[in-house]
């Protein structure tokens, strides 16, 4: 807490400018009007304040807005955002995507901090769902964002937003997350033709049920082994040797290298040896 002291004569700030960097902490507290600071927040980032000085400016804003900052101030926080705690951010009501982008830019290149996580949570909850523009923005800053959400949080993603998802955004999603995302992707891409559909749906197939894999096996899709290895074991087990052969196409030879790993290992054990022998790969059930 900065002690309340009278502002020295002639030092009262008329505007937020570079002269303020020479003010001591107590002078900033005494001489900068909080309302002036709030209206000229956009200037703060152009001025090389020390961390200690930024603490004073934050304190002034906290006093002016004890219930939480208005969005007009939040949008121009810049590096002052790094001084905010998750508790501060929970008081905010951020509705503009531009505000979100401005604050994410401040944290760019760093891991997602608790502050950023809280900001995103507030923003998404305020919107009611994770729309395409928001998802575009978040995955641009944090490619792993989608897979950081719980399965329940993912359930609020509308199918239309799935178009914003790139394969790398799903790299760390687990089977339960893909269980939630796959039906949305299926719905989003349903009007595409066979080969285009497979290119789009491929990253989501870790959530696909057996009947969809059977259908894909009839479409000459040539699934690669990396995708096959991410399929749900319970979805792969009922597939016949012929269906797996059609599903993988020329990649079927890769089964030999993966025969000790799930789901290939479990699938092999479910097949008749005569059927496995038709592949000519020396797989032993």
């Amino acid at each position: 807490e900065v002690e309340k002291t009278a502002c020295p004569s002639g030092k009262k700030a008329r505007e937020i400018d570079e002269s303020l960097i020479f003010y001591k902490k107590w002078e900033l507290e005494a001489c900068v009007d909080a309302a002036l600071l709030a209206t000229q927040m956009d200037r703060v980032n152009a001025i090389p304040f020390t961390y200690e000085q930024l603490d004073v400016l934050k304190h002034k804003l906290d006093e002016l807005y004890p219930q939480g900052y208005p969005e007009s101030v939040i949008q121009h926080l810049g590096y002052l955002f790094l001084k905010m705690s998750p508790e501060d951010i929970r008081k905010w009501n951020v509705t503009s995507l531009e505000t979100l982008k401005a604050l994410l830019e401040v944290n760019k290149g760093h891991e997602m901090s608790p502050q950023v996580a809280t900001l995103i949570d507030r923003f998404v909850k305020g919107r009611g769902q994770l729309d395409k523009d928001t998802l575009d923005t978040l995955t641009a800053f944090y490619p792993g964002y989608l897979c950081s959400l719980s399965p329940e949080e993912l359930s609020s993603v509308p199918p239309s937003s799935i178009w914003a998802v790139r394969p790398q955004d799903l790299d760390t999603c687990d089977p339960r997350q893909l269980d939630v995302l796959y039906p949305k992707a299926r719905l989003a891409f349903q009007n595409m033709n066979g080969s285009e559909y497979f290119v789009k749906i491929q990253s989501f197939l870790g959530g696909a049920p057996t009947e969809d894999l059977k259908a894909l096996s009839q479409q000459n899709v040539s699934m690669d082994l990396a995708t096959f290895m991410k399929l749900r074991t319970d979805a792969v087990l009922p597939l016949t040797v012929a269906e797996v052969q059609k599903l993988l196409g020329p990649h079927v030879e890769g089964l030999k290298a993966e025969e000790r790993h799930r789901p290939v290992r479990d699938w092999i054990l479910r097949q008749r040896q005569d059927d496995l022998d038709t592949l000519g790969l020396g797989l032993q059930g």
Epitope: S150, P151, E152, D174, R176, Q177
Partner: antibody, heavy 116, light 112 residues
Amino acid sequence: EVQLQQSGPGLVAPSQSLSITCTVSGFSLSRYSVHWVRQPPGKGLEWLGMIWGGGNTDYNSALKSRLSISKDNSKSQVFLKMNSLQTDDTAMYYCARSLGWYFDIWGAGTTVTVSS
Amino acid sequence: DIVMTQSPSSLAVSAGEKVTMSCKSSQSVLYSSNQKNYLAWYQQKPGQSPKLLIYWASTRESGVPDRFTGSGSGTDFTLTISSVQAEDLAVYYCHQYLSSWTFGGGTKLEIK
């Protein structure tokens, strides 16, 4: 405060069905999953099934034919219905909250005794 | 289904002692893409419902005393209580949530 409160019959006759209600407060059923878990006297925990925030359900494969889970978001209630009860279904039945992974809050449980 | 096996089934220790209990899964609950272990620990005191202690194998639930520590990866996990208190008398369950949801048989902790 987040709470899950359970109500049920206590005593059920063999071959009859069981209905338990889990009434939640402090969170929205559209944003969380609710699971059902049971515990026979002096034994461990057995997962029965769950209902996602969006309304889809998953069941324990061994009990699937006898179980039904539903909910009413507006009343903040989740319902477990289990058919054809036998004496080995005697247990404490719990509802628990989840975000799709582990269970962070549990109800106090409902004792169900199957006996004639 | 993934089968969870806990050992010992029961143990008795004096207050202030360190205790460890084991949980083994029939297949790995480590998901390679995100390097997370889909394992939780619960404490169930007599006459009460289970309470979450640890999730993601080692993350302590808020409000849980720091004497409780979860460790391990893949198929072998351990719950450690660094200095047992009288109020830790309970049954401890491990729980995997990678593929469906299954629990271990529990370890009963008694205080001498």
